[in-house]
Interface confidence: medium
C-alpha cells in the first residue's frame, strides 16, 4: 500500500515552484471539510466478523489530541453461528496518518509534521500456513 | 464543504503570550517518524474474506499528493471454499485523515488543514435485515 511520501520535496517544489528555504510553510489551521455531516455506520465495528473496539489516545502536544484507535476483539473471527472460529484470524488494518507535533519555544510555538501508524478497524483473514519441511 | 472551523479559537500558553488572530502557524514539513521501518502487511488485502484493491488518487495541490484508497472487490464476502457468500457484505472501513491543501493553488507556501474521509480497507459484516411490517 502506498504511504504518503516524505513530502518535503513534494511540498517544496510543485511543478516549477522554487524550493523552500527553511523547510517551513504557513498553515491555516481552520479545518476545511470538517465533519461534512458524514455519518459512518457505527455498527460496522459490532457487525463485523472481525469486530473491534475503539481506544481513545490523548496527547496534549499532538494535533489532533484525541485519536481513536481500533483494537480487534478476538484473535479469531466470528462465524455465522456467532462462535469464534480460530481457523481464521482477526487482524487490524493499519493506516499511516499525518499529525502535527507542538514544540513549545517561548511564545512562538513551533509545529512539525509527524507520521503515525494507526489501527483503524479489523478484517478477517486466512492465516498463512507454514508447511513443515 | 464545511468552512473553517477555526471558530473555536484557541488557548494560549501560560505566561504573557498574545494569541494569534490570523489563524496561521508555521509548520516544519520535515516529517518525524518517517518510515521507522514500519511495514504494513500488504497481503491482508488479498487474504481477507472481504478483499480489496487500492486506487491511487493524485492531487499536486495536496500533501500527501498521492493517497491510496481502498475499494472492496466484491459486494459479498469470500467463504472458506473461496466462493462469494452474498448473505454477508464487504464494506469499506473509513478513516478521517489530515492533509495539507496548498492555497492558492500554485507556488504559494501557504497551506490549510483539510480533513479527508479515506477508505482504508474492507471488513465483512452481517447485513441489517429490515423486517417487513
Amino acid at each position: 500500500r502506498k504511504n504518503p511520501k516524505a513530502g518535503v520535496p513534494a511540498l517544496q517544489k510543485a511543478g516549477n515552484c522554487p524550493p523552500l528555504e527553511d523547510n517551513t510553510v504557513r498553515v491555516d489551521i481552520r479545518i476545511f471539510n470538517q465533519n461534512q455531516g458524514i455519518s459512518v455506520p457505527r455498527e460496522f465495528q459490532n457487525r463485523s466478523s472481525s469486530p473491534w473496539d475503539y481506544n481513545i489516545t490523548r496527547d496534549p502536544h499532538r494535533f489532533p489530541s484525541e485519536i481513536a484507535e481500533a483494537q480487534c476483539r478476538h484473535s479469531g473471527c466470528i462465524n455465522a453461528q456467532g462462535q469464534e472460529d480460530s481457523t481464521m484470524n482477526s487482524v487490524a488494518i493499519q493506516q499511516e496518518i499525518l499529525v502535527l507535533r507542538r514544540e513549545p519555544q517561548g511564545c512562538s510555538n513551533s509545529f512539525r509534521l509527524e507520521k503515525m501508524l494507526l489501527k483503524v478497524g479489523c478484517t478477517c483473514v486466512k492465516p498463512i500456513v507454514h508447511q513443515a519441511a | 464543504r464545511k468552512n473553517p472551523k477555526a471558530g473555536v479559537p484557541a488557548l494560549q500558553k501560560a505566561g504573557n503570550c498574545p494569541p494569534l488572530e490570523d489563524n496561521t502557524v508555521r509548520v516544519d514539513i520535515r516529517i518525524f517518524n518517517q518510515n521507522q521501518g514500519i511495514s504494513v502487511p500488504r497481503e491482508f488485502q488479498n487474504r481477507s474474506s472481504s478483499p480489496w484493491d487500492y486506487n491511487i488518487t493524485r492531487d499536486p495541490h495536496r500533501f500527501p499528493s498521492e493517497i491510496a484508497e481502498a475499494q472492496c472487490r466484491h459486494s459479498g464476502c469470500i467463504n472458506a471454499q473461496g466462493q462469494e457468500d452474498s448473505t454477508m457484505n464487504s464494506v469499506a472501513i473509513q478513516q478521517e485523515i489530515l492533509v495539507l491543501r496548498r492555497e492558492p493553488q500554485g507556488c504559494s507556501n501557504s497551506f490549510r488543514l483539510e480533513k479527508m474521509l479515506l477508505k482504508v480497507g474492507c471488513t465483512c459484516v452481517k447485513p441489517i435485515v429490515h423486517q417487513a411490517a
Partner: antibody
Amino acid sequence: QVQLVQSGAEVKKPGSSVKVSCKASGGTLSSYAFSWVRQAPGQGLEWMGGIIPFFGTVNYAQKFQGRVTITADESTNTAYMELSSLRSEDTAVYYCARDRDYYGLGSPLHYYGLDVWGQGTTVTVSS
Amino acid sequence: EIVLTQSPDFQSVTPKEKVTITCRASQSIGSSLHWYQQKPDQSPKLLIKYASQSFSGVPSRFSGSGSGTDFTLTINSLEAEDAAAYYCHQSSSLPWTFGQGTKVEIK
C-alpha cells in the same frame, strides 16, 4: 469527565472592564477548543469568539472586535474572556463552552459539538 | 454573517404531542447545524450535532434532519421535562451564529 467551572457574578460600572474565567477540570485545556457565548436577559444565545489552545489562535465576532480579548493559561487549565468599555447592554450571562470536534481524529464516529458548557457567569453593568 | 431564522418563536403543546421546529439559514451551511436545549436558569445542552446525529444520552424522541439551508428538530411524543427553549447553531463559517430560539411550553 471534563467540567467547566466559571468565576462568580460581577457587578460593573459603565466604561469599566470585566474578566471572566473558565477552569477546565478533568481534562487538558490544550486538547480542546473553547467558545464564549453570552445571553442577555430574556434573549437568545450570541457567539462572542473562541480560542484554539493548541495553536494559540483566537477568533472574535465582528460585533465584539476591539472590546473582547480571549486568552488561556495552559498551566492552570483556565480560559479567560475580558470585555472592556462595558455598557448597560452588556448585562448578560456569559458562558464558556468546549468544542471537542476540532481535536478529534481517528474514526469519523467521534463528533461532539459544543458538548460541555460552564454554569454561566452573570455580569451586571449598572451605574 | 449567516443568519439563522427559527420558527415558530413559541409553541404551546400538550404532552405526547409531536413538536416540529424549523431553522432556515441565509445561505447553505451543508450539515454544519446543531441543536441545543436550554431550560430556565440552566446552561444550554447539546441535543443534535451536524443536523441529524444525536448526542450521547439524548432521548430517542429527539431527532434532527435537513441540509443546506433548511433544518428541522422533531420531538416525538413530548414529555413535561421537554419544556425549554431550543436553539439552532451553525459552525459552517465565522462568526458562528445561533437562531433566535423557540420556546416550547407544556399546556
